[in-house]
């Protein structure tokens, strides 16, 4: 997270760290007791790695009573996701067992009504991604509030030049932005999950390159079918 600040500890009980061989790789969001939603691109190079999900964490390194690492039983990428595009960049991870719920571990309601979030709405994005262009990684969860940007502006030739589909949404990126390591994490508007940080290699913090988020409401049928 660029231009953000440390989050209040355990105030985002839905927040997940998707890890490979014990290292944070991407964010994720607990959407059901046994399921975490993330981005499909996150794990494409984990061919011989052990994928696990950390729940109930604020610090990645320090012991915390609510922290628990879960193995992954199944990883279900959206069937139309591909490594060469950010379209359909969603992944559902089935935990090896139901998460132990409590004040610091709780699923987040996700948007089912397929309607664009009003431009200008302030939404919260959180993650353990880099906090500087130098690549400094935080140990504690960071967050930032970002205004939603209308799709027409986001699709300008000077911005994302038509790449933003109806199934994506944008947020402003003027010095405050999601960045590398935040991919797969949640964009939360009014207490509801609206978007998932896409995992392309986009430049961060440049206002001409707004943050791109996959709209979960657009994938309600797929999410429901996997969770069923």
């Amino acid at each position: 997270i660029l231009g953000g600040r440390e989050a209040e500890a355990h105030a985002r009980p839905y927040m997940a760290s998707v890890q490979v061989n014990g290292e944070h790789l991407c964010g994720g969001v607990l959407v059901a007791e046994q399921w975490v939603l993330s981005a499909a691109h996150c794990l494409e190079d984990a061919a011989d790695g052990k994928v696990q999900v950390l729940l109930g964490a604020h610090s990645l390194s320090q012991p915390e009573p609510s922290k628990r690492l879960y193995d992954v039983l199944r990883a279900v990428p959206h069937p139309d996701s591909r490594p060469d595009t950010i379209d359909h960049d969603l992944l559902l991870l089935q935990l090896s067992e139901k998460a132990t719920l409590g004040p610091a571990v709780r699923p987040l309601p996700w948007q089912r009504v397929d309607r664009d979030v009003e431009p200008g709405t302030l939404c919260d994005v959180a993650g353990w991604g880099i906090v500087s262009h130098a690549g400094r990684r935080p140990d504690r969860l960071q967050h930032v509030l970002l205004p939603v940007l209308d799709r027409a502006t986001c699709n300008r030739r000077t911005h994302h030049d038509g790449a933003i589909t109806q199934r994506m949404m944008c947020a402003e990126s003027n010095r405050r932005d999601s960045c590398k390591g935040d991919s797969g994490g949640p964009l939360v508007c009014g207490g509801v999950l609206e978007g998932v940080v896409t995992s392309g290699s986009r430049v961060c913090g440049n206002r001409k390159k707004p943050g791109i988020y996959t709209r979960v409401a657009s994938y309600a049928a797929w999410i429901d079918s996997v969770l069923a």
């Epitope: 061919a47 992954v72 069937p79 090896s96």
Partner: antibody, heavy 121, light 108 residues
């Protein structure tokens, strides 16, 4: 429906080389890490190689490291296994296998029909 | 590397009988990374049970899997003729991933 079809198996002399292919269909091949697994004449199964979805990372057991090379062509939905310095103990049925979990570290939920390599003088 | 030892190597059962085969690991394996395959003569292996106890698609509910640490098992509650096959366990908890030598189930 997922289909994996191996080809290229042959009779090769010790020290020789051979390249196996696996044509994949019915799924987004470029999204999956892929593996080769072999079955020796005494019916033992042995993992041979794994490659990440984009082909950036490859993994091998010590028994084939330095002699075998796994590669892929995502544009053609094809997986390869280049084998060199072949030994008699490489004689086996070679299967192309797709993992249940797309990144690779998991069980294999789809297997091809196999192609046979015989190394003998 | 982790060595998986399957026992018995060969077993014989009558239809309707309950059978259990075991897979022992030379060191502890997480239950998430222990899998079973079924193979019939002339066919490729088929994923049968993944992550210790989860039946793969199309596997009859008479099959079950259990275990933890270094000891795992596959059980058939009431054997049927079509279950005659060789069953292999596999671990992917530590690299290299390895397979057991198999248990061949024959029907009387």
């Amino acid at each position: 429906e997922v289909h994996l079809v191996e080809s290229g198996g042959d009779l090769v002399k010790p020290g020789g080389s051979l390249k196996l292919s696996c044509a994949a269909s019915g799924f987004t091949f470029s999204r999956y890490g892929m593996s080769w697994v072999r079955q020796t004449p005494d019916k033992r199964l042995e993992w041979v190689a794994t490659i990440s979805s984009a082909g950036s990372y490859t993994y091998y057991p010590d028994s084939v490291k330095g002699r075998f090379t796994i590669s892929r062509d995502n544009a053609k939905n094809t997986l390869f296994l280049q084998m060199s310095s072949l030994k008699s103990e490489d004689t086996a049925m070679y299967y192309c296998a797709r993992p249940l979990n797309y990144y690779g570290t998991s069980s294999f939920d789809y297997w091809g029909q196999g192609t046979t390599l015989t190394v003998s003088s | 590397q982790i060595v998986l030892t399957q026992s018995p190597a060969i077993m014989s059962a009558s239809p309707g009988e309950k059978v259990t085969m075991t897979c022992r690991a030379s060191s502890s394996v997480s239950s998430t990374y222990l899998h079973w395959y079924q193979q019939k003569p002339g066919s490729s292996p088929k994923l049968w049970i993944y992550s210790t106890s989860n039946l793969a698609s199309g596997v009859p509910p008479r099959f079950s899997g259990s275990g933890s640490g270094t000891s795992y098992s596959l059980t058939i509650s009431s054997v049927e003729a079509e279950d005659a096959a060789t069953y292999y366990c596999q671990q992917y908890d530590s690299s290299p991933n390895t397979f057991g030598a198999g248990t061949k189930l024959e029907l009387k």
